[in-house]
C-alpha cells in the first residue's frame, strides 16, 4: 500500500521554502497543478495553482507563493517566499485530472517556521523582490478547489461553507506589483 510520508522543513521567518514535485511528464505535463495546505480535520485547501493548461516554465505568483511548471523535466517547483510563523503546516502538490480525483505527489511537506532571522549577512534573504525576478505578467488561473475525502487527515469538515467549488476563481495580480496580503485566511 502507498504510505503517505512527510518531509520536514525547518525555516526562519523571512526565509524561502523551495521544493520540487516530480510527476510523470507524459501523463501530466500540461495538466493543471496546485499547492495545497492540509489542516487537521479539514479538506485540503488550494492556495495556488498553475494555469489550465499548465504553461511550461511560466511563473505564476499568488501572494507569496510562486509556482513554476517545467514540462521538459516533469517537475513543479514551489516557492513560498518571506515565510511567516503562521505558514507552518502540512502541504502537498496535486495534479488536477477531472473528472477523476486529484493526483497527489510525494512527499507531503511539514513546514515549521520559527521566529528570528538566521541568514548569512548580505544574502538578500529578506528582499524577495531582488531575489525573485519574475517576468511581468498578469495571469488568471482557475483553481478547482475540490479534492477527495480520502486525503482528509482526520474527520470530514463539519461544514462545507469553506470548501470552494470547481468554479472558484483566483485572480492573480500583476506579479511585479503584488499586494502582500496574508496568503492564508
Amino acid at each position: 500500500a502507498t504510505k503517505l510520508t512527510e518531509e520536514k522543513y525547518e525555516l526562519k521567518e523571512g526565509q524561502t521554502l523551495d521544493v520540487k514535485c516530480d510527476y510523470t511528464l507524459e501523463k501530466f505535463a500540461s495538466s493543471q497543478k496546485a499547492w495545497q495546505i492540509i489542516r487537521d480535520g479539514e479538506m485540503p485547501k488550494t492556495l495556488a495553482c498553475t494555469e489550465r493548461p499548465s504553461k511550461n516554465s511560466h511563473p505564476v505568483q499568488v501572494g507569496r507563493i510562486i509556482l513554476e511548471d517545467y514540462h521538459d523535466h516533469g517537475l513543479l517547483r514551489v516557492r513560498m517566499v518571506n515565510l511567516q510563523v503562521e505558514d507552518s503546516g502540512l502541504y502537498q502538490c496535486v495534479i488536477y485530472q477531472p473528472p477523476k480525483e486529484p493526483h497527489m505527489l510525494f512527499d507531503r511537506i511539514r513546514l515549521v517556521v520559527t521566529k528570528g532571522f538566521s541568514g548569512t549577512p548580505g544574502s538578500n534573504e529578506n528582499s524577495t523582490q531582488n531575489v525573485y525576478k519574475i517576468p511581468p505578467t498578469t495571469t488568471k488561473a482557475l483553481c478547482p478547489l475540490y479534492t477527495s475525502p480520502r486525503t482528509v487527515t482526520q474527520a470530514p469538515p463539519k461544514s462545507t461553507a469553506d470548501v470552494s467549488t470547481p468554479d472558484s476563481e483566483i485572480n492573480l495580480t500583476n506579479v511585479t506589483d503584488i499586494i502582500r496580503v496574508p496568503v492564508f485566511n
Epitope: 510520508t5 518531509e7 525555516l11 523551495d18 516530480d22 510523470t24 511537506i109 531575489v131
Partner: antibody, heavy 119, light 108 residues
Framework: EVQLLESGGGLVQPGGSLRLSCAAS????????MSWVRQAPGKGLEWVST????????YYADSVKGRFTISRDNSKNTLDLQMNSLRAEDTAVYYC????????????WGQGTLVTVSS | EIVMTQSPATLSVSPGERATLSCRAS??????LAWYQQKPGQAPRLLIY???TRATGIPDRFSGSGSGTEFTLTISSLQSEDFAVYYC??????????FGQGTKVEIK
C-alpha cells in the same frame, strides 16, 4: 525501513561494459526519483545519473553522457545502470541513492559496489 | 554548472570541541543545500537538508546555517563517532547536483 542493495560490480577491461543493479525495498519505489553516485578510490563524491519516479526523465553527468544509461523497473523495484565504453577513470564505488520526495538530495544510500576498469 | 567549494580540506579537533565546516557555492542556491557524513568503508549518510533541517535520527549537536552562497555545518561538541569526511551538495533545481570536495574532520 528503506533498503538499497547494489550488485553487478567487478573488474572490466577498458572499452568493456557492465550493468549495475540496485534492489530497493521499504518505500513506495515508483514515487521517488533514484540516482547513482560514485566515488573514485580516495576521492570525493560525484553524481552520475538520476531518473524520475516514473522513469520518464533522466539526467546524466557530462563525464558519462552517451556511455551510461539509467533505467528502472517499477514492477520489480529495481534500478539499473548500463555502463558501456568504460574507461579507467570510471573506476569507483557506485552507490545507489534514493532521492528525497521534495528535492534533489539523497536521503538513503546503498552500501555501494566496486567497479574496476583495468587491463 | 555550480561549483561547491569546502574549507578547510582537513580540520583537526579534539573530542568535546566545536567544529565549524564551510561550504561556498559559485552562485546563489537559496537554502538548497545538504550535508552528508561519510566514515571510512561506509556509504554517506544524510545529516542536514534545506541548509537547516536535520535528517531523521541526527543528533542535535549537528546544525546547519547559511543561505545564498555561504553555508556552515557546526558540530557543537565532537564525539568520537563524528570523526569522518563531510560533504556539502547543492540541489537548486535540475541536475547536475554537485558535491563539494569534502572536509576531513580528524582527531587532534
Amino acid at each position: 525501513e528503506v533498503q538499497l542493495l547494489e550488485s553487478g560490480g567487478g573488474l572490466v577491461q577498458p572499452g568493456g561494459s557492465l550493468r549495475l543493479s540496485c534492489a530497493a525495498s521499504g518505500f513506495t519505489f515508483n514515487a521517488y526519483a533514484m540516482s547513482w553516485v560514485r566515488q573514485a578510490p580516495g576521492k570525493g563524491l560525484e553524481w552520475v545519473s538520476t531518473i524520475s519516479g516514473s522513469g520518464s526523465t533522466t539526467y546524466y553527468a557530462d563525464s558519462v553522457k552517451g556511455r551510461f544509461t539509467i533505467s528502472r523497473d517499477n514492477s520489480k523495484n529495481t534500478l539499473d545502470l548500463q555502463m558501456n565504453s568504460l574507461r579507467a577513470e570510471d573506476t569507483a564505488v557506485y552507490y545507489c541513492a534514493k532521492v528525497a520526495g521534495s528535492n534533489f538530495f539523497f536521503d538513503h544510500w546503498g552500501q555501494g559496489t566496486l567497479v574496476t576498469v583495468s587491463s | 554548472e555550480i561549483v561547491m567549494t569546502q574549507s578547510p580540506a582537513t580540520l583537526s579537533v579534539s573530542p568535546g570541541e566545536r567544529a565549524t565546516l564551510s561550504c561556498r557555492a559559485s552562485q546563489s542556491i537559496n537554502h538548497n543545500l545538504a550535508w552528508y557524513q561519510q566514515k571510512p568503508g561506509q556509504a554517506p549518510r544524510l545529516l542536514i537538508y534545506g541548509a537547516y533541517t536535520r535528517a531523521t535520527g541526527i543528533p542535535d549537536r549537528f546544525s546547519g546555517s547559511g543561505s545564498g552562497t555561504e553555508f556552515t555545518l557546526t558540530i557543537s561538541s565532537l564525539q568520537s563517532e563524528d570523526f569522518a569526511v563531510y560533504y556539502c551538495q547543492e540541489f537548486i533545481l535540475f541536475p547536475p547536483h554537485t558535491f563539494g570536495q569534502g572536509t576531513k574532520v580528524e582527531i587532534k
